[in-house]
Amino acid sequence: VPLSRTVRCTCISISNQPVNPRSLEKLEIIPASQFCPRVEIIATMKKKGEKRCLNPESKAIKNLLKAVSKERSKRSP
């Protein structure tokens, strides 16, 4: 991100809307760090490759994270 900045968080807006795990291309979780004091979750949707930041505090998003980690643990040997 360019320009004068206070902290290096990249999410300007966040979505609280439920996301269907099947519509997800990719889910990036960026932990809080010295650069950004909050966890950032960036969802890339299969349709058009649209990227959105998700609200880590939202119940719907917490459920999504659980569903995704369950799916991953099923796939891993």
Epitope: P2, I12, I14, I42, K51, R52
Partner: antibody, heavy 121, light 110 residues
Framework: QVQLVQSGGGVVQPGRSLRLSCAAS????????MHWVRQAPGKGPEWVAV????????YYADSVKGRFTISRDNSKTTLYLQMNSLRSEDTAVYYC??????????????WGRGTLVTVSS | QFVLTQPPSVSGAPGQRVTISCTGS?????????VHWYQQLPGTAPKLLIY???NRPSGVPDRFSGSKSGTSASLAITGLQAEDEADYYC??????????FGGGTKLTVL
């Protein structure tokens, strides 16, 4: 009703200060980044600044860096622009605008009606 | 002054098709950033017309369409109507500058 209601414009002398306000209603204000965009008479829009949904991240255009400060009060669902050391070239209609929510691709899906700031001696 | 380049004016008769071009650079369109278009009627705030290169917000007629290729983009208006007379601005995100706009194109319906 989803809207942005602006206030605080007027005539001000060069070197003086002014604060603009933008009251939001009808949407979840604390989920959206908010921008200020200005438009000089007869010219195209010029982006001024953005603030993240929680107020933690702020970015400014070079032309206002060090003079303007963007802030927000989520409890009052209001966005602010503090403008210091005003210059004649800051004369413009100032719009507040809601960020679209698209990651790293800032654009504006809701605009206020604008408030005129005239910097003149 | 404006990072994105648009023609100052275009015109067309009612019912005709007109296009408005918008030329960017490597740090905006060339870096994969989308183009967005706004319509500004006299004395009003800009209104989002096209987002993400070719998507219309609800309420925008399908006479309006957008496209982007490389460092160029365009807005097409078919079946031109008197109420389309307005200023049109392209906008993108620039990895060096943040939000950038075109200088605007005045559309005159003859």
């Amino acid at each position: 009703q989803v809207q942005l209601v602006q206030s605080g414009g007027g005539v001000v002398q060069p070197g003086r200060s002014l604060r603009l306000s933008c009251a939001a209603s009808g949407f979840t204000f604390n989920s959206y980044g908010m921008h200020w965009v200005r438009q000089a008479p007869g010219k195209g829009p010029e982006w001024v600044a953005v603030i993240s949904y929680d107020g933690n991240s702020k970015y400014y255009a070079d032309s206002v860096k060090g003079r303007f400060t963007i802030s927000r009060d989520n409890s009052k669902t209001t966005l602010y622009l503090q403008m210091n050391s005003l210059r004649s070239e800051d004369t413009a209609v100032y719009y507040c605008a809601r960020d679209s929510g698209s990651y790293l691709d800032w654009y504006f899906d809701l605009w206020g009606r604008g408030t005129l700031v005239t910097v003149s001696s | 002054q404006f990072v994105l380049t648009q023609p100052p004016s275009v015109s067309g008769a009612p019912g005709q098709r007109v296009t408005i071009s918008c030329t960017g650079s490597r740090s905006n369109f060339g870096a994969g950033h989308d183009v967005h278009w706004y319509q500004q009627l006299p004395g009003t705030a800009p209104k989002l017309l096209i987002y993400g290169n070719n998507n219309r917000p609800s309420g925008v007629p399908d006479r309006f369409s957008g496209s982007k290729s490389g460092t160029s983009a365009s807005l097409a208006i078919t079946g031109l109507q008197a109420e389309d007379e307005a200023d049109y601005y392209c906008q993108s995100y620039d990895s060096r500058l943040g939000v950038v706009f075109g200088g605007g194109t005045k559309l005159t319906v003859l």
